[in-house]
Structure formats: structure tokens, C-alpha cells
């Protein structure tokens, strides 16, 4: 299950992937010295009856339907870390693996 | 972060896990040998802003607020197999490890 | 603790159809967690797997008996029996009950613990 | 089905010998394996489950080892009420098999 790619052009309702690139500078978070801008992704889209479904699990509550279950929702399913430079709380500068990212697959969960 | 947990008599409206039991037998699925039933657990509640975030990403999407992004939802975040004796699609039956089929905790995502 | 006791006669004339019944006590035979089955065992050979079965009914045979083979439940008496059809003398085995589960703590299948003390079954005539 | 061949099939060995029983798969069966000891006019008694986990109330002497097709139990000191057949059991696919057995002497 590969999850599906889009962009602003596509006519696409159903969960996707699209392309966002983060710029740190525009946040105004000058403690991050590398990179100051990367391309995150993001998901967004419909979740209809068993699209896309990463976990059997999400098709079991939708057939369970408990009380206060929202449904499916079109989040990552696949995410990847990033080296980043930036200062720590202590002001000392860190090189260091951030995981948690960048979304390589969206699905619904 | 260990995520919430909550119960039908809980007043929490973020972000939590709710107990769920599945049972196989009242969905009629007769290809399912054991269990007959089994604690799934599900993920409900309000994600509001940097509530339970498992991802970086997560916030940031929320930071660049791009066209489409419906903000974080409740979703499992951690989640576990179980072990399930099954008949498969050539009528064996199997003894196999079923990943995602257990919530052990939610988050916004 | 669960406990199985096997009652059945042990001499069956060939052709003819092998009743066992397997009694349980210390637990329920409707526990959702637990199975039923049947095995045996040939003089001098072997464990074969005869079948197993849950409390609704559902049931799950050896192919290689199946054409002869039932395997019922009576939650009333708690008790689950064996009939095997047209028997000869290659039926001729000790036959044992024994409880499958479901650990739904670990999500772990659990077979054949315990066991009946076990029927010495005689084909002849 | 799958078949389950034992070796040795019969096995002499004295008290405090450290002792191995194979279990060889047709094909390859994961971990789902358990190991059984029978004494005569007795019902098995289970001693290992999915091919390495010690049954509860097994003395920790036996151990089970192996996954795919080849697996083992190893007795690290024998004593004398171990002396009995012991038998495997894959419950991967059905029909589930056992194992012919091996028979455990005392020399």
C-alpha cells in the first residue's frame, strides 16, 4: 500500500499526500540553523469505507462503531527523520536526527 | 508520551483511548478460529493545539497552515499485533501474527 | 484448574462407529477462550491430530479423517464428544481429548494443555 | 501437510548428561512449534511452546531453541524422571503434525 501523491492541481477528494515545504525563517524560529527550509508533506482527503486503511484495526472499529469513534482519518502512515542543526535549550549547537519529519505516505487511521 | 486513557464514564473530550472489544462472532466473520474475540481499543477526542502531538510534523503542518490541512486528529500512535488461527483464501487454516490490530496508545497526528 | 475425563466403551466391532465423550470440569466448555479437540495415537506410533472444536459448533477437521469424523459440543452436561465412522482395525489407537486456548492477556494460541488421561480404543471383532 | 521428522529416534544417556533432540520441518513453520513429553500410560505434558517459551511449573533444565525448519530441545542435566518420549508438534498450518517421536533411556 503505496498511499496516493497529489498536488494543488489535482482534482483528487480521497486521502493524499501533498507537497508543503516548512521555512523556518518565515516561523521566525532562528534557533534552527540547518536547513532552513525542507519539504515535509502533508496529508490530507477523504477516508472512505476501507481506503486506504493501514491497520486492519481501522477497519474492525468502523465495523464495531463504538460510541464517540469519529471514523477514519487521513494522517501519516509512514514518516522519516531529518538531520537538523539547531540550539538546544542550553544554547549549545547540536547536530541531530529529528525523526517524525517528513510524511513519505499518508493513509487513514 | 503516553497518551491518554479513558472509559465511557470519563469526561475527557481530547484525545484518548477507549476500551474496545471486537468480537468476531457478532460480525459474523465465521473464517476467524480464535480469537472470537479480542481488546482492540479505540482512539476518540479533540486535538487541540500541541495536545498529544506524536510528530514534529505535526506541529508544523499547523505552523504553515496549507491549503487543505484539516489539523491533527485522535489516531493510534502506537499499536501491537496479535497471534490469530485463521482460514486464509485457499481454505488452510494458518497460525500468524497480524500486525496493527491492538490501539496501545493515541495521539494527534 | 481444567481437567478432562474420557468415558467410552474401548472394544468396537469393525465397520461399525467409535463414540468418545471427554467431561470437563474446573472450567466452562462455552469460555470463549477455549477449544476442544481430539487426538490419538496408534500402538507403538505417533500423535495424529484428529480435529478441533469451539462451544458454538464451529469445527475444524484432519483432512485425512474427515470424511468420517464428528466432533460435537453439549454445554449443558459441559461435555464434547468424538464419533468416528466405519472404523477398522487401523483405528485402533489410544485416543485422548484435549483443550486448545486463546491467552487474550498475550494474544497467544495455547495447544493441546491439558489432556485426558487418555481411552485405549480396540478395533475388532 | 507439513511433515515433522525427529532424530535421533531413540536415545541412551545416563543421569547429569546434557542431551539435544532435533526436530526438522518440511518447510519452514516460523516459530510454531511446541515440544510434548509422554511417559508410558500417561497423556503428553507440554513443555515448550512457540519453539523456545518454557511452559510455566517445566523445570528451567529443558530449553527449546530453533526457528524456520529446524528447532531443538535440550535436556542440560538429565534426571531420572525425564527418561520418556518426547515428541514436537508444529501448529503453523493444519492439519496440525507431530513428530515420531524420540525415546529417552537410561543407560
Known amino acids: 500500500n503505496l498511499g496516493l501523491d497529489c498536488d494543488e492541481h489535482s482534482s483528487e477528494s480521497r486521502c493524499c499526500r501533498y507537497p508543503l515545504t516548512v521555512d523556518f525563517e518565515a516561523f521566525g524560529w532562528d534557533w534552527i540553523i540547518a536547513p532552513k527550509r525542507y519539504k515535509a508533506n502533508y496529508c490530507s482527503g477523504q477516508c472512505e469505507y476501507m481506503f486506504m486503511q493501514k491497520y486492519p484495526h481501522t477497519h474492525l472499529v468502523q465495523q464495531a462503531n463504538p460510541r464517540g469513534s469519529a471514523g477514519p482519518c487521513c494522517t501519516p502512515t509512514k514518516m522519516s527523520p531529518i538531520n537538523m542543526l539547531y540550539f538546544n535549550d542550553k544554547q549549545q549547537i547540536i547536530y541531530g536526527k529529528i525523526p517524525g519529519m517528513v510524511v513519505d505516505r499518508c493513509g487513514c487511521s | 508520551n503516553l497518551g491518554l486513557d479513558c472509559d465511557e464514564h470519563s469526561s475527557e473530550s481530547r484525545c484518548c483511548r477507549y476500551p474496545l472489544t471486537v468480537d468476531f462472532e457478532a460480525f459474523g466473520w465465521d473464517w476467524i478460529i480464535a480469537p472470537k474475540r479480542y481488546k482492540a481499543n479505540y482512539c476518540s477526542g479533540q486535538c487541540e493545539y500541541m495536545f498529544m502531538q506524536k510528530y514534529p510534523h505535526t506541529h508544523l503542518v499547523q505552523q504553515a497552515n496549507p491549503r487543505g490541512s484539516a489539523g491533527p486528529c485522535c489516531t493510534p500512535t502506537k499499536m501491537s499485533p496479535i497471534n490469530m488461527l485463521y482460514f486464509n483464501d485457499k481454505q488452510q487454516i494458518i497460525y500468524g501474527k497480524i500486525p496493527g490490530m491492538v490501539v496501545d496508545r493515541c495521539g494527534c497526528s | 484448574q481444567v481437567q478432562l475425563v474420557q468415558s467410552g466403551p474401548g472394544l468396537v466391532k469393525p465397520s461399525e462407529t467409535l463414540s468418545l465423550t471427554c467431561t470437563v470440569s474446573?472450567?466452562?466448555?462455552?469460555?470463549?477462550?477455549?477449544?476442544w479437540g481430539w487426538i490419538r495415537q496408534p500402538p507403538g506410533k505417533g500423535l495424529e491430530w484428529i480435529g478441533t472444536?469451539?462451544?458454538?459448533?464451529?469445527?475444524y477437521y484432519n483432512p485425512s479423517l474427515k470424511s468420517r469424523v464428528t466432533i460435537s459440543v453439549d454445554t449443558s452436561k459441559n461435555q464434547f464428544s468424538l464419533k468416528l465412522s466405519s472404523v477398522t482395525a487401523a483405528d485402533t489407537a489410544v485416543y485422548y481429548c484435549?483443550?486448545?486456548?486463546?491467552?487474550?492477556?498475550?494474544?497467544?494460541?495455547?495447544?493441546?494443555?491439558?489432556w485426558g488421561q487418555g481411552t485405549t480404543v480396540t478395533v475388532s471383532s | 501437510d507439513i511433515q515433522l521428522t525427529q532424530s535421533p529416534s531413540s536415545l541412551s544417556a545416563s543421569v547429569g548428561d546434557r542431551v539435544t533432540i532435533t526436530c526438522r520441518a518440511s518447510?519452514?513453520?516460523?516459530?510454531?512449534l511446541g515440544w510434548y513429553q509422554q511417559k508410558p500410560g500417561k497423556a503428553p505434558k507440554r513443555l515448550i511452546y512457540?519453539?523456545?517459551s518454557l511452559q510455566s511449573g517445566v523445570p528451567s533444565r529443558f530449553s527449546g531453541s530453533g526457528s524456520g525448519t529446524e528447532f531443538s530441545l535440550t535436556l542440560s542435566s538429565l534426571q531420572p524422571e525425564d527418561f520418556a518420549t518426547y515428541f514436537c508438534l508444529q501448529h503453523h498450518i493444519y492439519p496440525w503434525t507431530f513428530g515420531q517421536g524420540t525415546k529417552l533411556e537410561i543407560k
Open positions: 518447510q519452514d513453520i516460523r516459530n510454531d
Open positions: 512457540a519453539a523456545s
Open positions: 474446573g472450567g466452562s466448555i462455552s469460555n470463549s477462550n477455549y477449544y
Open positions: 484435549a483443550r486448545d486456548y486463546y491467552d487474550s492477556s498475550g494474544y497467544y494460541y495455547n495447544w493441546f494443555d491439558p
Open positions: 472444536t469451539y462451544y458454538s459448533g464451529t469445527t
